[in-house]
């Protein structure tokens, strides 16, 4: 039924076909809202609705609480607090937003349907309340290439959501966008796992993500990266980590990204990028990087960053990029630093290195009465090292002696503690 | 020790245009962000825009933008804005301040701008 | 934009009394990025805790800040009459850049 998603089926007779003419005509039709087009209709014209129940459902039907258009191949089941996936969506469905749910979990084939879903390519499930996701969720949807997870607190994310089995190499999936900003759990929430760990082990399982061209990790609390994890997506073009908590890239390796344009990294913690970070993003031939707002810290280890940032074109804003630390540098432009600028200073605070320095001059007197009182004791101490020494020497002679008896073979037999 | 030294007070025609200065003084010039922000008597503050001396690049208020003009003179270390299209609701003190994303360190004395006919 | 939302609007305090402003933030602020500054009647604004929690160059120890995400909280923890002024909070974070609209702390 071209142009239109409609609960009831084709007519036979006239006024019917004339009705369905209209649905076509007005596009969205809800199933449920009662200010929508299809219920207005309905209530103008009473034997629409009275020759269309005595009808036997339509295979592309609209599912309760949801709104569809055939002609825009979209399904909207939005913010109507639904606790599980409608299983009756429209075969035609290429466009599938079920945001503002409850959905809780996401069971193994949640869109698995007779016939598939074939044509679905973009599902957005954000804000649902999502909090497990199993293996092989997003399974029999051989055209999904946009996904959205945003905004559900994932405790339990399967190492094969997206890959689907556990075999060490899957068919690869079909997704090309993965997004998957604010997904961290409270921290009360959280399994006793690293939370970057499953996330990675779900981006990584079975190689099923190779053609994946844009990761976004927004907003999860992320304190690293852990080093494999790009180097496995090797198709990615956009890479957005923004509003992280990382506070190195040390050791992220770019170098397999080759195909990489943006690389988000706004809203971290990042306080210096080094030599080998710089010299892999600046290999990256269509690469730009954001970097605004990070608590950079402009002492001699910014020395390499700064020079890199004068001459490259890769960073956008550069020129916004201040010093956060020290003190005496906090809102230095970057850019305007130059080596003289980044010393590296003793980064004790006053306080702390008067109280050093004090540390220092007792520990230093005490040593000094202890070299005082040994140089004025020197006989006694020598007196004492010469019995020291006589008393080692008779032990010794008498060790040896008992050494050589257990040595000899004919003396076997004797117990080796027996006085000889 | 740093200080930023503002223009004059100005009385302006209703459509006419002002240009204000801040002069930069106790620090180098190019290092630092000047930001410009307004306050209305008995109001609160409102940024502007702000400047990159060093780099030239300028980020306005899209309130503000086409009718604020930020530029800088790094060899006299002076910031400048120019208002154009006044109106009575630009009757206010204008001030610049030199600091960044950790706050702005330093305000110079404002400028006060009153557009009457 | 970021809206930032300050309370109370005016506040009065005794001497020696604690004093807590507060400044709520429409959408969420990193920390390192909100500010606030002190205004006297007549006088240009000055920083007065920057980066939320950091006191600015010749603040008394009895101010304090803290705050994350979209609440933030300045504190005074004995009200004195050089305290009495208007305190704006400030966000760098977000352009364009915001304030709020200020509190007026009087003395009572």
């Known amino acids: 039924m071209p142009g239109g998603c409609s609960r009831g089926p084709a007519a036979g007779d006239g006024r019917l076909r004339l009705a369905r003419l209209a649905l076509v005509l007005l596009g969205w039709v809800s199933s449920s809202s009662p200010t929508s087009s299809a219920s207005s209709f309905s209530s103008s014209a009473p034997f629409l609705a009275s020759a269309v129940s005595a009808q036997p459902p339509l295979p592309d039907q609209c599912p309760a609480l949801c709104e569809c258009s055939e002609a825009a191949r979209t399904v909207k089941c939005v913010n109507r607090n639904l606790t599980e996936v409608p299983t009756d969506l429209p075969a035609y469905v290429r466009n599938l937003f079920l945001t503002g749910n409850q959905l809780a979990v996401l069971p193994a084939g949640a869109f698995a349907r007779r016939p598939p879903l074939a044509e679905l390519a973009a599902l957005n499930l954000s804000g649902s309340r999502l909090d497990e996701v199993r293996a092989g969720a997003f399974e029999h949807l051989p055209s999904l290439r946009q996904l959205d997870l945003s905004h559900n607190p994932l405790a339990d994310l399967s190492p094969f959501a997206f890959s689907g089995s556990n075999a060490s190499v899957s068919a690869p999936s079909p997704l090309v966008e993965l997004i998957l900003n604010h997904i961290v759990p409270p921290e009360d929430e959280r399994q006793n796992r690293s939370f970057e760990g499953m996330v990675v082990a779900a981006l990584l399982a079975g190689r099923a993500l190779q053609g994946l061209r844009r990761l976004e990790l927004a907003s999860n609390h992320f304190l690293y990266l852990p080093r494999d994890v790009l180097a496995q997506l090797p198709s990615l073009r956009h890479l957005d980590l923004s509003n992280n908590s990382l506070v190195s890239l040390t050791y992220v390796s770019f170098r397999n990204l080759t195909h990489l344009e943006s690389l988000h990294l706004e809203d971290n913690a990042l306080k210096v990028l080094h030599n080998g970070t710089l010299a892999e993003l600046q290999g990256l031939p269509h690469i730009r990087v954001f970097l605004d707002n990070n608590p950079w810290v402009c002492d001699c280890h910014m020395a390499d960053m700064v020079t890199w940032l004068k001459e490259t074109e890769v960073v956008q804003g550069k020129d916004r990029l201040t010093c956060a630390y020290p003190e005496k540098m906090r809102n230095r432009v970057l850019l305007e630093l130059n080596s003289a600028d980044l010393d590296c200073d003793p980064i004790l605070p006053p306080s702390l290195q008067t109280s050093y320095v004090f540390l220092g001059i007792v520990l230093a007197l005490i040593g000094a009465i202890f070299l005082l009182v040994l140089y004025l004791n020197r006989k006694g101490i020598k007196k004492w090292m010469h019995n020291i020494r006589d008393a080692c020497r008779d032990h010794m002679e008498g060790y040896h002696y008992r050494y050589e008896i257990n040595a000899d073979p004919r003396l076997t037999n004797l117990s080796s503690n027996s006085d000889v | 020790q740093v200080q930023l030294q503002q223009s004059r007070p100005e009385l302006v025609k209703p459509g006419a245009s002002v240009k204000m200065s801040c002069k930069a003084s106790g620090y180098t010039f190019t290092d630092y962000v000047i930001s410009w922000v307004k306050q209305r008597t008995g109001q609160g503050l409102e940024w502007i825009g702000e400047?990159?001396?060093?780099?030239?690049?300028?980020y306005y208020n899209e309130k503000f933008k086409g009718r604020a003009t930020l530029t800088a003179d790094k060899s006299s270390s002076t910031a400048y804005m120019q208002l154009s299209s006044l109106t009575s609701e630009d009757s206010a003190v204008y001030f610049c301040?030199?600091?960044?994303?950790?706050?702005?360190?330093?305000w110079g004395q404002g400028t006060t701008l009153t557009v009457s006919s | 934009q970021i809206v930032l939302t300050q309370s109370p609007a005016i506040m009065s305090a005794s001497l020696g009394e604690r004093v807590t402003l507060t400044c709520t933030a429409s959408s969420s602020v990193n920390s390192n990025y909100l500010h606030w500054y002190q205004q006297k009647p007549g006088s240009s604004p000055k920083l007065w805790i920057y980066?939320?929690?950091n006191l600015a160059s010749g603040v008394p120890a009895r101010f304090s800040g803290s705050g994350s995400g979209t609440s933030y909280s300045l504190t005074i923890s004995s009200m004195e009459a050089e305290d009495a002024a208007t305190y704006y909070c400030?966000?760098?974070?977000?352009?364009?850049?915001?304030f709020g609209a200020g509190t007026k702390l009087e003395l009572k």
């Open positions: 301040a030199m600091g960044g994303n950790y706050g702005f360190d330093y």
């Open positions: 400047i990159y001396p060093g780099s030239n690049s300028i």
């Open positions: 400030h966000q760098y974070h977000r352009s364009p850049l915001t």
């Open positions: 980066s939320t929690s």
